[in-house]
């Protein structure tokens, strides 16, 4: 049979099962891609959007690796990547995505590796990805690259439906904490890259989750803004005993100023000012507990005093009752006088 034609602006190799359409100013995916293509590079173009049907079988039944990086893509629409039965690797990096449809891959995709480096800078794209992942459309995903996206927080539950995930790259973002991130479902996770973020401390909840992941062997935490106060004590203890953290010897304090540059592994509890008020939420919590105990003690003492003086109190109560009765009788008499018209003059002229 004659060799399949190569789309005009592209370069093709049947021997390499590859088509490259690189920096060709394309505004759409070429419709006449050869059926042998396993590796498709459409990069550095001006696609703008990826509509449903732009890439579809049966012509692309063999397509396993798709690189769509740097194409000025703003939208990946519902069904755009749904009809690719062999797709295992997708790179959407360097696109200013505003919309990533939760139905972009259809109901289920064989995709194993997804790169979104620098493509989730807009909230719409991040939320779309979160919905897409939570819907379970990418349950076969083993590698997820979310680096260089300026992320402050991950949407809650975003990583909950990724049972096959082995490698997660969150480097070069602005993550300030991991409190709302659940790692528990990532039972196959082997490597986690959190370098170049704004993490100040790792809390016990996160550390406990990591301890519970049997395959997790490589955690990268370099170049974060570690705050070396009392709250970091548990993290330092974990670091000292963990063999999961790459280059842990190089991790150092960023704050407070007097601790800047100090190696985390060389910190002592005495240096961490655990008596000083540092972590406001936990200090408040401690204060409330203490206040509760004090109030309970006062209440108990009060009840004890009442019990010990029960006879005196009973006598005192009787006295009060008698006094009240006398007082009320006076009111009662006065009311009767006021009610009788014959006694009106008397009441107005007397001090009853």
């Amino acid at each position: 049979q004659p060799p399949a034609a190569c789309p005009a602006p592209c370069e093709c190799s049947e021997a390499a099962k590859t088509v490259k359409c690189v920096n060709k100013n394309l505004t759409e995916v070429p419709p006449d891609l050869p059926p042998y293509v396993r590796n498709l590079f459409i990069t550095g173009n001006r696609l703008g959007r990826l509509p449903a049907g732009a890439l579809s079988a049966p012509r692309l039944a063999e397509l396993g690796s798709l690189n769509l990086s740097g194409n000025h893509l703003r939208a990946v629409e519902a069904g755009a990547l749904a009809a690719l039965p062999a797709l295992r690797q997708l790179d959407l990096g360097g696109n200013p995505l505003a919309e990533l449809s939760p139905l972009a891959f259809g109901r289920a995709s064989p995709l194993e590796e997804l790169a979104l480096r620098g493509a989730l800078r807009e909230q719409g794209a991040l939320l779309g990805l979160a919905d897409l992942l939570q819907a379970g459309a990418l349950r076969n995903l083993s590698r997820l690259e979310l680096a260089d996206n300026g992320l402050l927080l991950l949407p809650t539950g975003m990583l909950g439906a990724l049972p096959a995930l082995r490698h997660l790259d969150l480097s070069n973002n602005s993550l300030v904490g991991l409190r709302n991130v659940s790692f528990q479902g990532l039972v196959r996770l082997q490597s986690l890259n959190l370098s170049d973020n704004s993490l100040g401390v790792l809390r016990n909840g996160t550390l406990a989750q990591w301890r519970g992941l049997p395959a997790l062997r490589r955690i990268s935490l370099s170049h974060n803004t570690w705050v070396c106060d009392c709250a970091i004590e548990d993290m330092v203890a974990w670091l000292k005993e963990s063999d999961q953290v790459e280059g842990k010897e190089a991790l150092s304090c960023a704050f407070p100023e007097k601790m800047a540059g100090r190696a985390l592994l060389k910190l002592n509890t005495s240096e961490l000012n655990c008596s000083a008020p540092v972590d406001v939420p936990s200090q408040l919590q401690t204060s409330y507990v203490f206040l509760g105990i004090v109030l309970a003690l006062i209440g108990a003492i009060f009840l004890l005093v009442l019990y010990l003086n029960r006879k005196g109190i009973k006598k005192w109560m009787h006295n009060i009752r008698d006094a009240c009765r006398d007082h009320m009788e006076g009111y009662h008499y006065r009311y009767e006088i006021n009610a009788d018209p014959r006694l009106t003059n008397l009441s107005s002229n007397s001090d009853v």
Partner: antibody
């Protein structure tokens, strides 16, 4: 990471059939092309042919009439048969795996067997 | 078939020097070209794929460039372990072909 281990007869007489097998460890068969390359003593590398996981083959035209490459996915093995050998077929024979999809992976013959020296002599 | 011609056949340099190896194709291979290093008694080792991409674990002193018919492998500062034979290989068309090799030896 995929590793390859190869074996087969090292000494042949002219007109016999060279038979080599390569076992694949630590990886899946899909996505890869399984190749055979040879290197005569003191010379350069010569591509013999390749097969993919579906059994589709491509051969060097200079050897095509004598070469058969087959795959046994159940055993994770692929084999080379070269018929009617002569002294010119004396070489180190390598099996190699080329990963046919790009990502963090290589784009060439990225994993090689240890090589089997085959000598054809009467 | 596509013929790859490597030059020079032998290159004599000292450690620390810069090495430039050339590979020319008889017709365009786009960027479907790889470079391999082979030491005596060993299998070849992939250095560069797709003309300019370094394979995993390859030091930064190795770089590849070129497209179409002319390709270059550059070793910025030679280390003692770099002295070996270097081959280019094209995967643009069947049959896949290798260059005849450039021997890099210590001066």
């Amino acid at each position: 990471q995929v590793q390859l281990q190869q074996w087969g007869a090292g000494l042949l007489k002219p007109s016999e059939t060279l038979s080599l097998t390569c076992a694949v460890y630590g990886g899946s068969f899909s996505g890869y092309y399984w190749s055979w390359i040879r290197q005569p003593p003191g010379k350069g590398l010569e591509w013999i042919g390749e097969i993919d996981h579906s059994g589709s083959t491509n051969y060097n035209p200079s050897l095509k009439s004598r070469v058969t490459i087959s795959v046994d996915t159940s055993k994770n093995q692929f084999s080379l048969k070269l018929s009617s050998v002569t002294a010119a077929d004396t070489a180190v024979y390598y099996c190699a795996a080329w990963f046919g999809e790009l990502w963090d992976y290589y784009y060439g013959m990225d994993v090689w067997g240890q090589g089997t020296t085959v000598t054809v002599s009467s | 078939e596509i013929v790859l011609t490597q030059s020079p056949a032998t290159l004599s340099l000292s450690p620390g020097e810069r090495a430039t190896l050339s590979c020319r194709a008889s017709q365009s291979v786009s960027s479907f070209l790889a470079w391999y290093q082979q030491k005596p008694g060993q299998a070849p080792r992939l250095l560069i794929y797709d003309a300019s991409n370094r394979a995993t674990g390859i030091p930064a002193r190795f770089s590849g460039s070129g497209s179409g018919t002319d390709f270059t492998l550059t070793i910025s500062s030679l280390e003692p372990e770099d002295f070996a034979v270097y081959y280019c290989q094209q995967r643009s068309n069947w049959p896949l072909t290798f260059g005849q090799g450039t021997r890099l030896e210590i001066k």
